[in-house]
Amino acid sequence: AFGISGVQKYTRALHDSSITGISPITEYLASLSTYNDQSITFALEDESYEIYVEDLKKDEKKDKVLLSYYESQHPSNESGDGVDGKMLMVTLSPTKDFWLHANNKEHSVELHKCEKPLPDQAFFVLHNMHSNCVSFECKTDPGVFIGVKDNHLALIKVDSSENLCTENILFKLSET
């Protein structure tokens, strides 16, 4: 696993890798918080779940997600964070066997139990933004990002490249 600063380095080094999306290039445990430093917490049972976006109590440990990094199998002409036209994608897992999924119909972010190979809905193109922030773009719906709406995670359509820096789709990854 590598630190946050290593994301950019690793992105640049992608062309050294022959892995093309079947297996992750690397995996990394990180806590996920919003641009405004609210924590993302996953309350997960067998048959139900809730995802909290809130200020965390001082004495509480932050939840972590397992980010698995993949190199996109399909070259992209879009200006992403890939190298040589390939893009860096991630899956996000808060606990064993569960992954975040994009439900484009409902514009919602969901948790689903599934086995590998994971469906496309579980993959997000990783964008490195300013101030050490990242954003997660749906593989299945370009231009749609994981974002925060009414203290919940939701899918948010970004109309233009200027809006890529809108705070509600920016997240921070931290090792602590």
């Epitope: 996953f42 997960l44 001082k58 509480e60 440990k61 939840d63 972590k64 606990t95 569960f98």
Partner: antibody
């Protein structure tokens, strides 16, 4: 439906040993941390011990450290508490409890006790 | 070791509001849970994460937590609410319970 069924309680002499079991059903057992909580007759609740979903991490109250051992067999969906060097003050109803939520990668004891068994009585007396 | 202090007993008339306090150092920096235990029965979680109610728990149960005190409030108390109530937090990878409060509905 989540079910937790304790067994193994009984009368034991001071210095003796006893092994409690908790059979779990209705949920993915290996995904949840589990705990033992006890209640002496007429007294309040006291947390005793906990174990992570994989069994790789264990936690104990100071009052039982070195004497009690918590373990689990995920293939049998069963939680255990091995109690050695028992004392009169260990007399209590012992409850098995499941964390409300599945363990996050960060681990540790963090969640409330969402489900409880019916308890098994342990009496330590000569 | 970390100590949570509850009043031993609280009395309330039917339909009135019962408030049970749970005091501990910097309590508001932790998430509090509350359990109800009726005679001869196992405890039941009634409040978690300070304010949240599990499904099946009536709306008359509510919680708050700030400073050094967490509070469980039972609004419109009913005879069936007569029970022992325990607060609980996690501290340094251990579970810590308060001593319990017996709620009597007069």
């Amino acid at each position: 439906e989540v079910q937790l069924l304790e067994s193994g309680g009984g009368l034991v002499q001071p210095g003796g040993s006893l092994r409690l079991s908790c059979a779990a059903s209705g949920f993915t057992f290996s995904s949840y941390a589990m705990s033992w909580v006890r209640q002496a007759p007429g007294k309040g609740l006291e947390w005793v011990s906990a174990i992570s979903g994989s069994g790789g991490s264990t936690y104990y109250a100071d009052s039982v450290k070195g004497r009690f051992t918590i373990s689990r067999d995920n293939s049998k969906n069963t939680l255990y508490l091995q109690m050695n060097s028992l004392r009169a003050e260990d007399t209590a109803v012992y409850y098995c409890a499941r964390d409300l939520w599945m363990e996050n990668w960060v681990g540790g004891l963090r969640y409330p006790f969402g489900y409880w068994g019916q308890g098994t009585m342990v009496t330590v007396s000569s | 070791s970390y100590v949570l202090t509850q009043p031993p007993s609280v009395s309330v008339s039917p339909g009135q509001t019962a408030s049970i306090t749970c005091s501990g150092e910097r309590m508001g920096d932790k998430y509090a849970a509350w359990y109800q235990q009726k005679p001869g029965q196992s405890p039941v979680l009634v409040i978690y994460r300070d304010t949240k109610r599990p499904s099946g728990i009536p709306e008359r149960f509510s919680g708050s937590n700030s400073g050094n005190t967490a509070t469980l409030t039972i609004s419109g108390t009913q005879a069936m609410d007569e029970a022992d109530y325990y607060c609980e937090v996690k501290k340094s990878d251990t579970g810590v319970f308060g001593g319990g409060t017996k709620v009597t509905v007069l």
